[in-house]
């Protein structure tokens, strides 16, 4: 089939007093592969500090995924969730207070 | 994408050091994380930390004592102060931007020596 | 510190040959690894990224492979501008650490 861009979706949750899980999830996508990450100034965090999901199936023809990682309250500017999917690519920042971000794609 | 590092090529022991790195091509405001990297002769490299785009900075522990990067958004440069310096801080010294996973482009590094 | 263990530390090949740098981590770097090219007069370019992703204008001589704490860079077919000194770095870990580079030479 053709290529059909992910809707990229970026939510927080209080993790612990002083931290909050950021999680970047991607929807809506074919084909599966797909580079997602957190970032931190532009630098990709560790390996060890974050969590992904399996690429699944979402019943649609396409597939999702996910990636969780834990910051300090405070310093959500700094974090960035990078999404590389058919050879566009596109950063997305962590919303503030309880809102949530959702978009297509873009160069 | 542009990087060229300048400063004084000798510097004497105690005293600080202290570089530019000057970025064409891109806004150090932009995104990505800007570096110094330094390679002593013999060949090793050393990061020394970076300024994101957003102002933060990270140092390596090693140096974190001596070291401070700063930047001027209005010419799009960014610096780096080295204090107490002494010869083993002899070194060529090098900026780059830290994109995603790597640096992805380089000054071509300024020599710097220490001595009296 | 992650220490990252480079060999050769030179190597004289001849033109068309294929050549092999290996670069060994201390601890598992999860594909966090990347190799530059240092010409004689200093300048460094990025070559490999993230194992074996090609940066944009890289001959398509050069690859990467490797993972946990092994990983290497191949030249398909050695060409006179090869000539240089090539490293590895680690981005997993923080401080990034450097390989003590690969001078390649010409036979």
């Known amino acids: 089939g053709s290529t059909v861009p992910p809707m990229v979706n970026v939510t927080r949750s209080e993790a612990s007093e002083g931290n909050i899980t950021v999680t970047c999830r991607a929807s809506g996508f074919y084909p599966w592969n797909i580079t997602l990450s957190w970032r931190q100034d532009g630098v990709s965090l560790s390996h060890d500090t974050q969590q992904w999901g399996d690429v699944l199936p979402d019943g649609n023809g396409t597939y999702q995924t996910w990636v969780a990682t834990r910051i300090c309250q405070g310093e959500e500017q700094r974090f960035t969730c990078y999404m590389e999917h058919s050879g566009n690519h596109s950063t997305h920042p962590v919303p503030s207070g309880n809102s949530h971000h959702h978009h297509h794609h873009h160069h | 994408v542009q990087l060229q590092e300048s400063g004084p090529g000798l510097v004497k022991p105690s005293q600080s050091l202290s570089l530019t790195c000057n970025v064409t091509g891109y806004s150090i405001t932009g995104d990505y994380a800007w570096n110094w990297i330094r390679q002593f002769p013999g060949n090793k490299l050393e990061w020394i930390g970076y300024i994101g785009y957003t102002g933060s900075t990270t140092y390596n522990p090693s140096l974190k004592s001596r070291v401070s990067i700063t930047r001027d958004t209005s010419k799009n440069q960014f610096f780096l102060q080295l204090n107490s310096v002494t010869p083993e801080d002899t070194a060529t010294y090098y900026c780059?931007?830290?994109?995603?996973?790597?640096?992805?482009?380089w000054g071509l590094g300024t020599s710097v020596t220490v001595s009296s | 510190d992650i220490q990252m263990t480079q060999t050769p530390s030179s190597l004289s090949a001849s033109l068309g040959d294929r050549v092999t740098i290996s670069c060994r981590a201390n601890q598992d770097i999860s594909h966090y690894l990347n190799w530059y090219q240092q010409k004689p007069d200093g300048a460094v370019k990025l070559l490999i990224y993230?194992?074996?992703r090609i940066h944009s204008g890289v001959p398509s001589r050069f690859s990467g492979s490797g993972s946990g704490t092994d990983y290497s860079l191949t030249i398909a077919n050695l060409e006179q501008e090869d000539v240089a000194t090539y490293f590895c770095?680690?981005?997993?870990?923080?401080?990034?650490?450097f390989g003590g580079g690969t001078k390649v030479e010409i036979k």
């Open positions: 780059a931007r830290w994109r995603n996973w790597a640096m992805d482009y």
């Open positions: 770095q680690q981005g997993n870990t923080p401080p990034t650490t």
């Open positions: 993230y194992t074996s």
